[in-house]
Amino acid sequence: ELCDDDPPEIPHATFKAMAYKEGTMLNCECKRGFRRIKSGSLYMLCTGNSSHSSWDNQCQCTSSATRNTTKQVTPQPEEQKERKTTEMQSPMQPVDQASLPGHCREPPPWENEATERIYHFVVGQMVYYQCVQGYRALHRGPAESVCKMTHGKTRWTQPQLICTGEMETSQFPGEEKPQASPEGRPESETSCLVTTTDFQIQTEMAATMETSIFTTEYQ
């Protein structure tokens, strides 16, 4: 069941899913100057069964200047360089997301896709937060949020994370400086904009995650 709204917004923090539950939608969005082909997929869908999940449908973008020219979905080498995967900064042994039942890994890029991805999450989805560059984390609990169903309505749990400027003194000593990450501001309703630049999760956050949804590569 689709979550009604976005994960909570934490000042100076951005969030990321490590794996996507079945039923998750990723809108087929194209970068400026390109558009989704007329009879192309509206979205990609995480789908599958208990043993295997994958993204259904392919997003295809065409130049908005020309008609009926379908661009291939295979990323070119230069694009792959721009969007290189990152290593999980975790002391624990990561598990390949593809092997996690009921979840999909980060979908591969498609040619001329938009710089931001708009996901629509489903009940049970977990997202993880980290402070943006120039801010450090003050943890009071897990830096994560889960979409839950209560009394027939969906809601996201509140992550216990405060991001403070580096110059401010921390009341939680021993916290390490977070890795740099882009500031991705969640949009309203169920749309969650996640920038496609590298997103590195720091060690301390990784330690709060369930090992079952670790991955060695993600955007």
Epitope: L2, G23, M25, N27, E29, R32, R35, R36, K38, S39, S41, L42, Y43, L45, T47, D56, N57, S64, I118, H120, E187, S188, E189, T190, S191, L193
Partner: antibody
Framework: QIQLQQPGAELVRPGTSVKISCKAS????????LGWVKQRPGHGLEWIGD????????NYNEKFKGKATLTADTSSSTAYMQLSSLTSEDSAVYFC???????WGQGTSLTVSS | DIVITQSQKFMSTSVGDRVSVTCKAS??????VAWYQQKPGQSPKALIY???YRYSGVPDRLTGSGSGTDFTLTISNVQSEDLAEYFC?????????FGGGTKLEIK
């Protein structure tokens, strides 16, 4: 919460044009395709076309090309559908709808009558 | 254009019963099918996307299934609030097309 607000009714003369509005709120207007649907008793639901406000891109059902023109004003998060050379066949309820995830406006009842 | 056929225009059922509304596409549409519920004087409300996934707030008594050309919306333990018209829609090929609708009547 997503809302698509449309005027309840429009009464126009045959041969004229009408511009129906659809004001969006509760989501980022420029990031989603917004479609228009016609509903007439006995004719079911018909997809007229859709627009991507972020780039002004449009798709039209061939049947409605020349009849409907879709536009969007991003500054007011409002989509418009202009229907031209109106006849009694155009009398119907017109819905605007965010394409995906789907969410529909309440509809505008258009009556074409002299 | 892809033609969507809802062969049953009307269906009669009783509270507590189970009813299945069917929809047939003239060509393969994968699972790119949505189901809508429309009550008199209201706009259609989205129930199901991608043939089998429920929108938020849709009770789990409503279940979508099917792929390719044949699709079903099943309502188990029918309630009086289910009295409405049900439409399916394909969005696999443009223009997106709808079935003619099935009106559910409660005995």
């Amino acid at each position: 919460q997503i809302q698509l607000q449309q005027p309840g009714a429009e009464l126009v003369r045959p041969g004229t044009s009408v511009k129906i509005s659809c004001k969006a709120s509760g989501y980022t207007f420029t990031n989603y395709w917004l479609g228009w649907v016609k509903q007439r008793p006995g004719h079911g639901l018909e997809w007229i076309g859709d627009i991507y406000p972020g780039g002004g891109y449009t798709n039209y059902n061939e049947k409605f090309k020349g009849k409907a023109t879709l536009t969007a004003d991003t500054s007011s998060s409002t989509a418009y559908m202009q229907l031209s050379s109106l006849t009694s066949e155009d009398s119907a309820v017109y819905f605007c709808a965010r394409v995906t995830p789907a969410s529909w406006g309440q509809g505008t009842s258009l009556t074409v009558s002299s | 254009d892809i033609v969507i056929t809802q062969s049953q225009k009307f269906m009669s059922t009783s509270v507590g019963d189970r009813v299945s509304v069917t929809c047939k596409a003239s060509q393969n549409v994968g699972t790119n099918v949505a189901w809508y519920q429309q009550k008199p004087g209201q706009s259609p409300k989205a129930l199901i996307y991608s043939a089998s996934y429920r929108y938020s707030g849709v009770p789990d008594r409503l279940t979508g299934s099917g792929s390719g050309t044949d699709f079903t919306l099943t309502i188990s333990n029918v309630q009086s609030e289910d009295l409405a018209e049900y439409f399916c829609q394909q969005y696999n090929r443009y223009p997106y097309t709808f079935g003619g609708g099935t009106k559910l009547e409660i005995k």
